[in-house]
Interface confidence: low
């Protein structure tokens, strides 16, 4: 089922450019902000920590000065700026701080922001928003199981961070749906989600709602699944 | 040098059982802490439990730590597993100078935990085909156990994708396999499950329409996306 808020934040940049990662920690009494990078298949590692009192970055050994810079646009707010990006800078960036919620020191991590660094020679289409294809329930399913499955296929989008949920028309309730993993196809991605509804709901319009950073005008795409008329179907006796 | 090793890259376990995640570490410090974190699919990193090097085995709810200082081993056990425990679990070693708050955590590579539905009677799937243009989807519903092979039968394949297999609300499995075919109208789906073969044609019904249930006459089947 869908959790609309449970989606990784994402920033996409080209090699050679710079990126900013916002720290979403809600603390107002810390002296140090730590920045970690987690790359798939590797252990998360600390890059640097920021000394709030002296406004100074302290880098881990081996990291090049000038690559990372923490700035604070306002009190208790931190942004990590990464310069001269290379593809190997891709990964999930976390800010963290030591906290003592129950009289025991623990390190609390913010939600994490995914940085995707692409090379300029990757020839992506100008429009990399999700392209939808709808599948309506098969007659067999509606007749035999008194239910119908709608499938929403989304293709040719970039980056791969996407959120899909389903609603009935004129309702804000998020319906329980299922989805496949996001899959890479050439330089873009595809994903599909499906919703099975009981027969009594087949005559209602359903919406597959897609949130993606490259949707037109930045708004959620709503893919309409029309109501289904089931009274035209007759069963073959052999299928009883 | 400080180092953390999580040798298990992934483990699977049914609901209600317990799973133990191993973690070995190397350190020259005498006093230190080990932390366990859970990483959700959204990549959020959630603190679970902390083990002090001079403390008794830590326990918090369903999480417990089996700490062996001499062996430099700190295993996490999650009992009474729930489906929501499916996630990646990281073990991390913390430096001792907490009062400074400048210390870093040294992480392992993590162990992915997959919690499977409870064991239940074997159930044969229902198989249905859905089509739109060259796109074909094979919908496989309510089967158990998980192992399954889905084959879209066509002589003119353009491309196929790996199937998505997910846990259904009933605790069984559902799956969808997608493909693109030049002869989509003639594509059928066959499924190998539990040493038996099930065909989509076994479920076909006679109809006075084409491949799909009709949208209401007032509706337009070629719906544009609203963006």
């Amino acid at each position: 089922s869908s959790n609309l808020e449970g989606r990784t934040k994402s920033v996409t940049r080209q090699t050679g450019s710079s990126a900013e990662i916002t720290c979403d920690l809600t603390v107002t009494n810390t002296f140090y902000i730590h920045w970690y990078l987690h790359q798939e298949g590797k252990a998360p590692q600390r890059l640097l920590y920021y000394d709030v009192s002296t406004a100074r970055d302290v880098l881990e050994s081996g990291l090049s000065p000038g690559k990372y810079y923490t700035h604070t646009p306002r009190r208790w707010s931190w942004i990590l700026r990464l310069q001269n990006l290379i593809e190997n800078d891709s990964g999930v960036y976390y800010c963290a701080t030591w906290d003592r919620p129950l009289n025991a020191w623990i390190k609390t991590f913010a939600k994490g922001t995914r940085l995707i660094v692409t090379s300029p020679d990757k020839q992506l289409d100008a429009d990399v928003s999700p392209k939808p294809t709808i599948f309506l329930p098969s007659i067999a399913e509606t007749k035999l199981q008194k239910a119908g499955t709608y499938l929403c296929l989304l293709e040719k989008f970039f980056p791969d961070v996407i959120k899909i949920h389903w609603q009935e028309k004129k309702s804000n309730t998020i319906l329980g749906s299922q989805e496949g993993n996001t899959m890479k196809t050439n330089d873009t991605y595809m994903k599909f989600s499906w919703l099975t509804v009981p027969e009594k709901s087949l005559d209602k319009e359903h919406r597959c709602i897609v949130r993606h950073e490259n949707n037109k005008n930045g708004v959620d795409q709503e893919i309409i699944f029309p109501p289904i008329k089931t009274d035209v179907i007759t069963m073959d006796p052999k299928d009883n | 040098a400080q180092k953390v090793t999580q040798a298990q890259s992934s483990v699977s376990m049914p609901v209600r059982k317990a799973v133990t995640l191993n973690c070995l570490y190397e350190t020259s410090w005498w006093s230190y802490y080990i932390f366990w974190y859970k990483q959700l699919p959204s990549k959020e990193m959630i603190f679970l439990i902390r083990q002090g090097s001079d403390e008794q085995n830590a326990k918090s709810g369903r999480y417990s730590v089996n700490f062996k200082k001499a062996a430099k081993s700190v295993a996490l056990t999650i009992s009474a597993l729930q489906l929501e425990d499916s996630a990646k679990y990281f073990c991390a070693l913390g430096e001792p100078n907490h009062f400074l708050n400048t210390d870093k955590l040294i992480f392992g590579k993590g162990t992915r935990v997959t919690v499977e539905p409870r064991s239940q009677p074997h159930t044969k799937p229902s198989v249905f085909v859905m089509k739109n243009g060259t796109n074909v989807a094979c919908l496989v519903k309510e089967f158990y156990p998980k192992d399954i092979r889905i084959n879209l039968v066509s002589s003119k394949k353009i491309t196929e994708f790996d199937p998505a297999i997910v846990i259904s609300p009933s605790g069984k499995y559902n799956a969808v396999k997608l493909g693109k075919y030049e002869d989509s109208n003639s594509v059928t789906c066959s499924v190998q499950h539990d040493n038996k073969t099930v065909h989509s044609t076994d479920f076909e019904v006679k109809t006075d329409s084409t491949d799909h249930v009709k949208p209401k006459e007032t509706e337009n089947t070629k719906q544009p996306s609203k963006s």
Partner: antibody
């Protein structure tokens, strides 16, 4: 459908207190922020306070700091503005508003920096007079 | 605090006229500026966000632009329903601040 409904306004004497409510529907206040904006009779718009329930952040205009408290009850999906030590200059229509979610700023950064208000309540009138 | 100085405070125009309202921020607010329309007794309505993005459902005769710290709302061809008061707002920094408003009246 997103809706905000304010209530709790009325006539109160200087120095008195009132609590305004903003009942939200069509979205959850826990995943959004709620803002109060007021408008004195015949005057312009003035931002009053903001709350981010997920993080607990609150912000206030200098003119109300120390006197007004913004809060939210996520179980009731309602935000509140507790107004104490009211003055004649607090007389206004009070609106609650919700920020517009759009990529990339608001949804991704979790920050208030990029949040114009797309949904407003109908307003509730607060009159402070002896 | 960031002051938003809006001008003019009022203007008279006829249906079909091109109308321009400006707002100057006292310091940089990047593009975090919105424009609202308000009619008597009603709540404000969002027209433009992020300085130049048209909010969904708003007629395309409304447009916004930015030049440094100067922000402009343009109504390309004034319609009868456009007679109202317009406010700019910066939301790039707390405290959030509004311009004083521009009342667009019938000539």
């Amino acid at each position: 459908e997103v809706q905000l409904v304010e209530s709790g306004g009325g006539l109160v004497q200087p120095g008195g207190s009132l609590r305004l409510s903003c009942a939200a529907s069509g979205f959850t206040v826990s995943s959004s922020s709620i803002h109060w904006v007021r408008q004195a009779p015949g005057k312009g718009l003035e931002w009053v306070a903001s709350i981010y329930s997920s993080s607990g952040y609150t912000y206030y205009a200098d003119s109300v700091k120390g006197r007004f408290t913004i809060s939210a009850d996520t179980s009731k999906n309602t935000a509140y503005l507790q107004m104490n030590s009211l003055r004649a200059e607090d007389t206004a229509v009070y609106y609650c508003a919700r920020p517009y979610y759009w990529y990339p700023y608001y949804y991704w950064s979790g920050g208030w920096e990029y949040a114009a208000f797309d949904y407003w309540g109908q307003g509730t009138l607060v009159t402070v007079s002896s | 605090d960031i002051q938003m100085t809006q001008s003019p405070s009022s203007l008279s125009a006829s249906v079909g006229d091109r109308v321009t309202i400006t707002c100057r921020a006292s310091q940089s607010v990047s593009s975090a500026v919105a424009w609202y329309q308000q009619k008597p007794g009603k709540a404000p309505k969002l027209l433009i966000y992020s300085a130049s993005s048209l909010y969904s459902g708003v007629p395309s005769r409304f447009s916004g632009s930015r030049s440094g710290t100067d922000f402009t709302l343009t109504i390309s061809s004034l319609q009868p329903e456009d007679f109202a008061t317009y406010y700019c707002q910066q939301y790039g920094e707390y405290p959030i601040t509004f311009g004083q408003g521009t009342k667009v009246e019938i000539k």
